[in-house]
Amino acid sequence: QPPPPPPDATCHQVRSFFQRLQPGLKWVPETPVPGSDLQVCLPKGPTCCSRKMEEKYQLTARLNMEQLLQSASMELKFLIIQNAAVFQEAFEIVVRHAKNYTNAMFKNNYPSLTPQAFEFVGEFFTDVSLYILGSDINVDDMVNELFDSLFPVIYTQLMNPGLPDSALDINECLRGARRDLKVFGNFPKLIMTQVSKSLQVTRIFLQALNLGIEVINTTDHLKFSKDCGRMLTRMWYCSYCQGLMMVKPCGGYCNVVMQGCMAGVVEIDKYWREYILSLEELVNGMYRIYDMENVLLGLFSTIHDSIQYVQKNAGKLTTTIGKLCAHSQQRQYR
Amino acid sequence: SAYYPEDLFIDKKVLKVAHVEHEETLSSRRRELIQKLKSFISFYSALPGYICSHSPVAENDTLCWNGQELVERYSQKAARNGMKNQFNLHELKMKGPEPVVSQIIDKLKHINQLLRTMSVPKGRVLDKNLDEEGFESGDCGDDEDECIGGSGDGMMKVKNQLRFLAELAYDLDVDDVPGNNQQATPKDNEISTFHN
């Protein structure tokens, strides 16, 4: 074991080193002192450290540790932040295109429905966007509202254009009839199933990414305990007190210290692993009716089919609705 | 795998796709993200080692600091002595995680539970839950996979998926479209005239 520095040595080296941490030299002793007031760098002999220096070392050690932690998580943090933003934007683009496709379908196939259809389609896709972003909207209600709104327009414009401008009372009757008679066949339920499944998965995918960011941010900005600060100081700076400026901590010792300092953080490990594996499982299942891109961009076609279905069953429907909403229609004709 | 209005509007001018060199789909982007995330699966357990390897640690030197004294790198003292007579490391570990860490662990537990419940069971992509009757008409047979179910791999594979983040220029001009379904079917088919 090498001998400690001779007591007559000056603390010159320590001073110049400490000056980088703390401009102003008043805290460093001129020559080694007994250091009986030290609490962390407990001396075996004379020391070049004072209580104030020790405090500064602790502060610096904790700061170093925070910076190391931040640089350790930088790549991971950037990966999740970037992807969360990219996917959110991508999903918004998908919703926008899905709306355009649906509007185009109405414009090109059912021009007489367009003004109102555009409005209902717009409201539906606004709700879709809000849902993805976490809004408390029920998907079945969204789909029901879309078909409830569309049916009176389809009935009065496509199936029965002879009717005068539709008044509220027949519209209400038609909205009711839409559900009671299942006028769109199984298409609304089909859309509900596809849209709710794909949007739920999309929403949780985004939520998971955002939570990933929160996890990294939390561990990134951890304030380390005083005990940890002492351990780090002893490992990184106490050698300076003995004038050993160039010595480095032993590897095994560093690991023991880090495990002690990070005992709490490391507890996240189990749940973090599970998070990544669960996210992978979710992503593997995001296809067909669990893929919002697939579902939303194909929605215009299912809506088109549903209108064809109504048109093809128009005879039966018009007769039944004629009876069901006769009261409302008579009031209109008066 | 999504369908574009080319299905519906025969004139291909209706959909002007901005061609992207790498036709990156959302699903490929998702898979890529997962692969990258998986390389960070041991992130937290590896942190202590990472920080030691990124802070000054004796590697090639014969001597190293153990918290109290200079020792030979491979001696038992290298890890042990520095911890003697110091505050109790075991005590430090026993304190348990900080409240913020406990909080984030709870959130992770919750999202993991959600992710598990949302994950699609293997081999069961379509649920058998769409057996609602249409307007007085039959629809799904008893053992069909939904009403959309059934044709195996051909199911939803037509057309390329949205070119990832490529703005699809969409032309909504009716002029580009050859007729519309309201008139494109039999000319006399104004369904309204049937109830005269």
Epitope: Q308, N313, A314, G315, L317 | I10, G141, N189, T193
Partner: antibody, heavy 119, light 107 residues
């Protein structure tokens, strides 16, 4: 021009299943419903059901629920009908037909597939 | 389900004659009716939809009429290619049903 090309004749044992195909060409397959119609030799026509190829949504005549299953493959523009638990009563010619899009009348028909169920 | 009753079940006529086939429905179907022609070993061919609208490519000697529950298909000046079976079908809504057919034979 619009064409519906059906698969060839089938000879099947009682209790077996057969899958008939109907390949569409000359139009956008996903824009129109495909119906299937049964005709027992020398007799009238019976509507079995229809499929909307785009969403693969199906509607059946109550009489044929459990007997026929309609599917479609968009990538090959082909509609399929599977008949199961065959009996001699299922021996017939089966047609696929395309409707007008917004009315249930059939302007285009396949050439028919003869299914013979015999022990 | 809507019942379709066609009459007569069979009919003999000569080239040049005019014939009428009728179809009665069990309930009012307004004008939602189609007529088809089928020749031996062939697929049906659409002649008329919406009770009176001639399908594309159908000769003008064919005409449909009626509404409600009574419908008829008239063929003026029969041609040799007109012989075969004729079916009515409602397109009022699912399930679709067809008439039993009328067999038109050469006298």
């Amino acid at each position: 021009q619009v064409q519906l090309q059906q698969s060839g004749a089938e000879l099947a044992r009682p209790g077996a299943s057969v899958k008939l195909s109907c390949k569409a060409s000359g139009y956008t397959f996903t824009s129109y419903g495909i119906s299937w119609v049964k005709q027992i030799t020398g007799q009238g026509l019976e509507w079995i059901g229809e499929i909307y190829p785009r969403s693969e949504s199906t509607y059946y005549n109550e009489k044929f629920k459990g007997k026929a299953t309609l599917t479609a493959d968009k990538s090959s523009s082909t509609a399929y009908m599977e008949l199961r638990s065959l009996t001699s009563e299922d021996s017939a010619v089966y047609f696929c037909a395309r409707d007008y899009g917004n009315i249930y009348s059939f302007a285009y028909w396949g050439q028919g597939t003869l299914v013979t169920v015999s022990a | 389900d809507i019942q379709m009753t066609q009459s007569p079940a069979s009919l003999s006529a000569s080239v040049g004659e005019t014939v009428t086939i009728t179809c009665r429905t069990s309930e009012n179907i307004y004008s939602y009716l189609a007529w088809y022609q089928q020749k031996q070993g062939k697929s049906p061919q659409l002649l008329v939809y919406n009770a009176k609208t001639l399908a594309e490519g159908v000769p003008s000697r064919f005409s449909g009429s009626g509404s409600g529950t009574q419908f008829s298909l008239k063929i003026n000046s029969l041609q040799p290619e007109d012989f075969g079976s004729y079916y009515c079908q409602h397109h009022y809504g699912t399930p679709l049903t067809f008439g039993a057919g009328t067999k038109l034979e050469l006298k």
